[in-house]
Interface confidence: low
């Protein structure tokens, strides 16, 4: 197909465009056409600009001519000058490039002349009659800035189609002037439109960042997502990050908030900063810097040991006075030689008995000054209804010192597919002080219910960790905390947490933590029934140190912040020392994360193209007063360039037609 019968085409650089219009026009018509589009007839003043014109025009047919913006009035010959007396339609004669086809003629230049460029060969300049209609014309458009052509995306149905401010539609652009529109058609049938706009930080750029064809799904470029790409129902995609990572500001890449090791001991993704720091058992966050950990002096906690306590970094030990020996719980003391089982078996009674050493509850709060405490003890929870309760404890016997944990049936807990969790905390980070009361089990303040919130990103239903919830009245029963009843056998029913060994208090939730899929529990457990708990009491989950001596506080109210489970040893070690180091696996208090309905990550809104319209006010290089091509005036004195800013003011046609009729020479290209 003859390219000259085709559509106009353009070549753009960062500051200007040349456009070729293959339309038969006179010089005046061509000039008007360029002005109406906001440009001018082409003024290739430099070799670089000439190269761009060359590349645009290409190798056209041999006889074809294109008007450019050079015009000379009658009798204005200046043959010694580079432009030979011709003036650019922008009003000046500045040039660093000429490409005349013929040497200058020495004639008197009686008629107005205009310059056309040969479409073939070396694109030489020919002068000729301005009234002659040639095969086309070249326009030039200047502008403040340009946007680079869009990179093709794999999801595109074809190349981007650009519409310039001068109404040229093409796919073949390297640069797009300010005000251009890019239309991208996607294979999914949808499309995207972008505008080349001024950017707030200066310069120009596209109104929207890619990828544009998200509707084509997640391939072949994973939707631009670093981790997971999810195809939504409406055809667009959203990016998600694997657990332990968060979506970056670009909505596509993922970042690991703990990668920079912001915490001294343990880091967990989540929280307002993107991560939260936790301290191991026996440590608490430093008051001046929550990223650091300082040793907790557990011995300052009333009743932590029945008799004597020695604190050390990361833990503590209980001791007994002469004639007494430490019981298996590591806390209580009994007369040397006496069997310790009785004291422990009487725990239920002691919990509910009135103690002799009463301590004002407010004083206890003040004394502990809000410090974090990782204490063994009893975790009180606010109930939604009065629970039954059974203590998961079996008396110790010399031949078998190991308390056992109930063995779940093969179908319980249900199997989970375990995602990799890069950071998990094995701490119970207590953010409220221990409440000590010798007279009754202390209930949490109504204003401060002890909830255990999940601070890590919500998991899918398949990957959720069970709940020890304080206030979840609306949760379906499957997600409510299970309470062990006095009348239940040792085999726990589905959806209830198994009993917890008081000596090895690792918590085995009803839905086993996906972080540790290989954990195994063996053995059976008998229960020691406690006396009935009054209906206003909260459900009790026993953990380490549940066998409290008579002088011990009734309960420890814990408010936790760390929510993930510690690594649970498959084979539980025997306790061979009286050491009460909370760091030892046998003395870790483990709290499962709250099970919450899976919350989908916030989806990125599908960006619609910017709806603003940008007024196009191209600035032209060498923008002296725009010149209107004039045809021959009545006398040389009047054949001057008259600046006129109004592009609509058409030049007057003065008798050139008559001249042309009488002068064969004027109609020929020299």
């Amino acid at each position: 197909q003859d390219p000259w019968a085709a559509e106009p085409r353009a070549a753009c650089g960062p500051s200007s465009c040349y456009a070729l219009f293959p339309r038969r026009r006179t010089f005046l018509e061509a000039w008007r056409a360029c002005r109406e589009l906001g440009g001018d007839l082409a003024t290739p003043r430099t070799p670089e600009e000439a190269q761009r014109v060359d590349s645009l025009v290409g190798a056209g047919p041999a006889s074809r001519l294109l008007w450019i913006g050079l015009q000379r009035q009658a009798r204005q010959c200046q043959l010694q000058r580079p432009l030979r007396g011709f003036t650019w339609t922008t009003g000046d004669q500045d040039t660093a490039f000429t490409n005349w086809a013929q040497p200058a003629s020495g004639g008197p230049c009686p008629a107005q002349r205009c310059v056309a460029l040969e479409a073939s060969g070396e694109h030489r300049w020919l002068e000729g009659s301005c009234t002659l209609a040639v095969d086309g014309y070249l326009c030039q458009f200047g502008f403040e800035g340009a946007c680079p052509a869009l990179q093709d995306e794999a999801g595109q149905a074809g190349p981007a189609v650009y519409t310039t401010p001068f109404h040229l539609v093409s796919t073949e652009f390297e640069w797009l002037p300010f005000g251009s529109v890019a239309a991208v058609q996607c294979q999914a049938g949808r499309g995207a439109s972008l505008l080349c706009v001024k950017q707030p930080e200066g310069g120009v750029g596209w109104s929207r960042a890619g990828p544009l064809c998200l509707g084509t799904g997640c391939s072949p470029d994973n939707g631009g997502c670093e981790h997971e790409c999810v195809e939504e129902v409406d055809g667009h995609v959203s990016c998600r990050c694997t657990e332990g990572f968060r979506l970056a500001a670009d909505g596509r890449s993922c970042e690991d908030p703990c990668a920079q090791a912001p915490c001294e001991q343990q880091c967990e993704p989540g929280g307002p900063q993107g991560y939260s720091c936790h301290c191991r058992l026996g440590f608490r966050p430093a008051e001046d810097d929550p990223h650091r950990c300082v040793d907790t002096d557990e011995c300052q906690i009333a009743g932590v040991c029945q008799q004597m306590c020695v604190n050390y970094v990361g833990g503590f030990e209980c001791y007994c006075s002469e004639g007494h020996e430490l019981e298996a719980d590591g806390i209580s003391c009994s007369p040397a030689g006496a069997m310790g089982a009785q004291a422990s078996q009487d725990l239920g009674d002691e919990l509910l008995d009135d103690g002799e050493d009463e301590e004002d509850e407010d004083e206890a709060w003040k004394a502990f000054n809000g410090g974090w405490t990782e204490m063994p003890g009893i975790l009180w929870m606010e109930p939604t209804q009065p629970p039954d309760f059974a203590l998961a404890y079996r008396p110790s016997f010399p031949e078998d010192r190991e308390p056992q944990i109930p063995y779940p049936e093969p179908t319980w807990p249900p199997p989970l597919s375990a995602p990799r969790v890069p950071y998990h905390s094995s701490v119970l980070s207590v953010t409220r002080p221990v409440v000590v009361s010798a007279t009754h089990p202390t209930l949490p303040s109504a204003h401060q219910p002890p909830v255990i919130p999940a601070t890590h990103p919500a998991l899918s239903r398949d990957h959720q960790i069970p709940v020890i919830a304080a206030n979840y009245p609306d949760l379906p029963s499957a997600y409510q905390p299970g309470i062990l009843s006095v009348s239940h056998s040792a085999q726990p029913p589905a959806h209830q947490p198994p009993m917890i060994s008081t000596k090895y208090p690792e918590l085995f939730p009803a839905h086993q933590s996906p972080m540790f899929p290989d954990t195994r529990v063996a053995g059976t457990q008998t229960t020691t029934h406690l006396p009935g708990i009054p209906p206003n009491h909260a459900p009790l989950v026993t953990t380490l140190g549940a066998q409290l001596p008579p002088q011990a506080p009734d309960a420890l109210v814990l408010r936790t912040q760390a929510t993930q489970l510690p690594i649970i040893p498959t084979a539980q070690p025997s306790l061979t020392t009286t050491s009460r180091s909370p760091v030892s696996p046998a003395h870790q208090i483990s709290v499962p994360a709250a099970t919450q309905p899976a919350a989908l990550p916030t989806l990125l809104p599908s960006q619609s193209p910017t709806n603003q319209t940008s007024p196009i006010s191209p600035t032209h290089p060498h923008s002296k007063a725009p010149q209107i091509p004039r045809e021959d005036g009545p006398s040389p004195k009047l054949a001057l360039w008259l600046p006129s800013p109004a592009p609509t003011a058409a030049p007057t046609a003065l008798g050139e037609a008559g001249l042309a009729e009488h002068s064969q020479r004027d109609d020929r290209w020299l």
Epitope: Q151, D152, E153, A154, Q156, Q187, A188, T216, G217, C218, S219, P220, D221, N222, G223, E226, C229, V230, E231
Partner: antibody, heavy 116, light 107 residues
Framework: EVQLVESGGGLVQPGRSMKLSCSAS????????MAWVRQAPTKGLEWVAS????????YYRDSVKGRFTISRDTAESTLYLQMDSLKSEDTATYYC?????????WGQGVKVTVSS | DIVLTQSPTTLSVTPGETVSLSCRAS??????LHWYQQKTNESPRLLIK???QSNSGIPSRFSASGSGTDFTLNIKDVEFDDVSSYFC?????????FGSGTKLEIK
């Protein structure tokens, strides 16, 4: 564990047809683009075709367009490549791959020999 | 089509050396460039995705960099187990294309 197992290869005469299957397990098949990549003996890897998650969008290399058809059965978690009008230059080991853009899981490959 | 040119075709190194494999694209592929390792008689294995992101389970000895049209795969402290062919692949535009591969040998 993600597994892709190809089947259906063998010896076939030029101009004849053959259908390859790829059974997928260990991931949610419907959520992923899938692709076929081939490797001629002692040669490099060559992408053949890809299919969108629903099987509605399909993409082919020019040399197989009109002759090969990629399809998927979401219910069966199976990917197919129907190869018609086979040519000797189609001789290769054909791999089924999960296409996240990059190919993150590959099958063990199935050999297709086109020869008279 | 985007053509990916890999060099060298074959690379012979001694264990413990660090090597660089090059992949050059005929057009810009942005960051949509990936690297695969293929051992003899095995399926390819994804090493690096999106220019420099290591796939899970890949030793940290493997790293990659580059942008636009020039990309490099680096292998530190080469081991006998690294003897393989290494291919780059682009997912910038259809058709998806692979480089012709670089074969790594141990002296």
């Amino acid at each position: 564990e993600v597994q892709l197992v190809e089947s259906g290869g063998g010896l076939v005469q030029p101009g004849r047809s053959m259908k390859l299957s790829c059974s997928a397990s260990g991931f949610i098949f419907r959520n992923y683009y899938m692709a076929w990549v081939r490797q001629a003996p002692t040669k490099g890897l060559e992408w053949v075709a890809s299919t969108g998650t629903g099987g509605d969008f399909t993409y082919y290399r020019d040399s197989v367009k009109g002759r090969f058809t990629i399809s998927r059965d979401t219910a069966e978690s199976t990917l197919y490549l129907q190869m018609d009008s086979l040519k000797s230059e189609d001789t290769a080991t054909y791999y089924c791959a999960r296409a996240y853009g990059y190919f993150d899981y590959w099958g063990q490959g199935v050999k297709v020999t086109v020869s008279s | 089509d985007i053509v990916l040119t890999q060099s060298p075709t074959t690379l012979s190194v001694t264990p413990g050396e660090t090597v660089s494999l090059s992949c050059r694209a005929s057009h810009s592929v942005g960051t949509n460039l990936h690297w695969y390792q293929q051992k003899t008689n095995e399926s390819p294995r994804l090493l690096i995705k999106y220019v420099s992101q290591s796939n899970s389970g890949i030793p940290s000895r493997f790293s990659a960099s580059g942008s636009g049209t020039d990309f490099t795969l680096n292998i530190k402290d080469v081991e006998f187990d690294d003897v393989s062919s290494y291919f780059c692949q682009q997912t910038q535009s259809w058709p998806l294309t692979f480089g012709s591969g670089t074969k790594l040998e141990i002296k």
